[in-house]
């Protein structure tokens, strides 16, 4: 806490500029008027203030605004925003998007701090869902930002926002979180026609029930192994040896390499070997001819 | 305050049916992912079905077909319409709240026991 | 679907003593892409439902006290109570819910000795 002293004759600041970067901390806390400060919040990030002359600033825009900062002053903190804690940030009601980008700009290149992660949190809740503009600002910031948000907070995104999405944007999404998003990216590219639609599910795939993979198996679609290796096991397991031959197209080859890994190893416990051995890739493991399997579920435990 | 209060248990005969009932307070049932989870007498704790706030629904492969997980947003509650009830359906039923939809459960209700006796 | 087993099925310690409850998947419950364990530990006590205690493996939930830990990672992991307490006496299970359906342990009994 600066102590309250009386401002020296003749400093007393009448607009916000560099002879300030001259000031002690007492004299920056006695010689600003606060008031001053927030009209004129634009000019700060100009100056190359020290961090213990931020810390004064931001004491005397808590004192004004103990009810929280109005937006005006938070679309030029700048630099100061640094200095805000997630406490002071919950007290803030930000609404529009430049305000957010120009926070957002300032902690550019680095890790999402728990400052950041307030922020964009009041922002989309004041918002009341994830519309396809913040989406856009926020994955171009954080492309992890869409797989830091839980499958709940994920069930509000609008279909319309899915388009905003990059496949980079989902590399760390688990099955749970693509299982809330797939639906909704199948209703926002539900127009395309079969091969641009492909190219635009299948990052998502890996929420896409059987049945879907079962038709896309019907349209030439050629999957790569990656994409395979990332759907949902049980969405694989009833596949048949002809299905998958199809999806994959002329990356059926990859299964070899991939025999032992989820779920190309629980798929083959499921086939019967007389199919595997259509591919002609060597696959080992299936069903021995001859046997009769009278419960799926029973094979897939002995497993 | 979080609360999550089960009734509709009781003791019904093999092939009966009953519905569940889980009033919730605190929360909106539909902003979350709601969950029931069972457990036999002396035994452990089984999933049995989930609702995603979205309204998908999946289900435990020992009651597919046979329980229906469903909400009314106007009364805030979950419900869980049990038919051709089995003996080893027999468990305190309790419905919870699944922590941002991840699988873990965060807030749970006291339970309700159903017991499938002729 | 994932089998939880837990080590032991009950446990005997002195007030104040060290507790460790072991939690084994049938598969990794890691997943690879985020680096986060999908695995939770719940007390249950006589009566009443689970409580949750631990979650992401090591994650405290609110209100739960310090003396409770979780660790480990892809199919192994524990729960340490450090240093136990009379209240402490309940059944934990650990659950899994890297894929669906969540799965659960068979439960670990700690009683005091």
């Known amino acids: 806490e600066v102590e309250k002293t009386a401002c020296p004759s003749g400093k007393k600041a009448r607009e916000i500029d560099e002879s300030l970067i001259f000031y002690k901390k007492w004299e920056l806390e006695a010689c600003v008027d606060a008031a001053l400060l927030a009209t004129q919040m634009d000019r700060v990030n100009a100056i190359p203030f020290t961090y213990e002359q931020l810390d004064v600033l931001k004491h005397k825009l808590d004192e004004l605004y103990p009810q929280g900062y109005p937006e005006s002053v938070i679309q030029h903190l700048g630099y100061l925003f640094l200095k805000m804690s997630p406490e002071d940030i919950r007290k803030w009601n930000v609404t529009s998007l430049e305000t957010l980008k120009a926070l957002l700009e300032v902690n550019k290149g680095h890790e999402m701090s728990p400052q950041v992660a307030t922020l964009i949190d009041r922002f989309v809740k004041g918002r009341g869902q994830l519309d396809k503009d913040t989406l856009d600002t926020l994955t171009a910031f954080y492309p992890g930002y869409l797989c830091s948000l839980s499958p709940e907070e994920l069930s509000s995104v609008p279909p319309s926002s899915i388009w905003a999405v990059r496949p980079q944007d989902l590399d760390t999404c688990d099955p749970r979180q693509l299982d809330v998003l797939y639906p909704k990216a199948r209703l926002a590219f539900q127009n395309m026609n079969g091969s641009e639609y492909f190219v635009k599910i299948q990052s998502f795939l890996g929420g896409a029930p059987t049945e879907d993979l079962k038709a896309l198996s019907q349209q030439n679609v050629s999957m790569d192994l990656a994409t395979f290796m990332k759907l949902r096991t049980d969405a694989v397991l009833p596949l048949t040896v002809a299905e998958v031959q199809k999806l994959l197209g002329p990356h059926v080859e990859g299964l070899k390499a991939e025999e032992r890994h989820r779920p190309v190893r629980d798929w083959i416990l499921r086939q019967r070997q007389d199919d595997l051995d259509t591919l002609g890739l060597g696959l080992q493991g299936g069903i021995p001819n001859g046997y009769l399997v009278l419960d799926l579920s029973m094979q897939e435990a002995l497993s | 305050e979080v609360q999550l209060v089960e009734s509709g248990g009781g003791l019904i005969q093999p092939g009966g049916s009953l519905r569940l009932s889980c009033a919730v307070s605190?929360?909106?049932?539909?902003?979350?992912?709601m969950t029931w989870v069972r457990q036999a007498p002396g035994k452990g704790l089984e999933w049995v079905s989930v609702i995603y706030s979205g309204g998908k629904t999946y289900y435990a492969d020992s009651v597919k077909g046979r329980f229906t997980i469903s909400r009314d947003n106007s009364k805030n509650t979950l419900y869980l319409q049990m038919n051709s009830l089995r003996a080893e359906d027999t468990a305190v039923y309790y419905c919870?709240?699944?922590?941002?939809?991840?699988?873990?459960?965060?807030?749970w209700g006291q339970g309700t026991l159903v017991t499938v006796s002729s | 679907d994932i089998v939880m087993t837990q080590s032991p099925d009950s446990l005997a310690v002195s007030l104040g003593e060290r507790a460790t409850i072991n939690c084994k998947s049938s598969q990794s419950v890691l997943y690879s892409s985020n680096n986060k364990n999908y695995l939770a530990w719940y007390q249950q006590k006589p009566g009443q439902p689970p409580k949750l205690l631990i979650y992401?493996?090591?994650t405290r939930e609110s209100g739960v006290p310090d003396r409770f830990s979780g660790s480990g990672s892809g199919t192994d992991f524990t729960l340490t109570i450090s240093s136990l307490q009379a209240e402490d006496v309940a059944v934990y299970y650990c659950q899994q819910y890297y894929s669906t359906p969540p799965t659960f342990g068979q439960g670990t009994k700690v009683e005091i000795k």
């Open positions: 992401w493996a090591s």
């Open positions: 919870a709240r699944d922590s941002g939809g991840w699988g873990y459960f965060d807030y």
């Open positions: 605190g929360f909106t049932v539909s902003s979350k992912f």
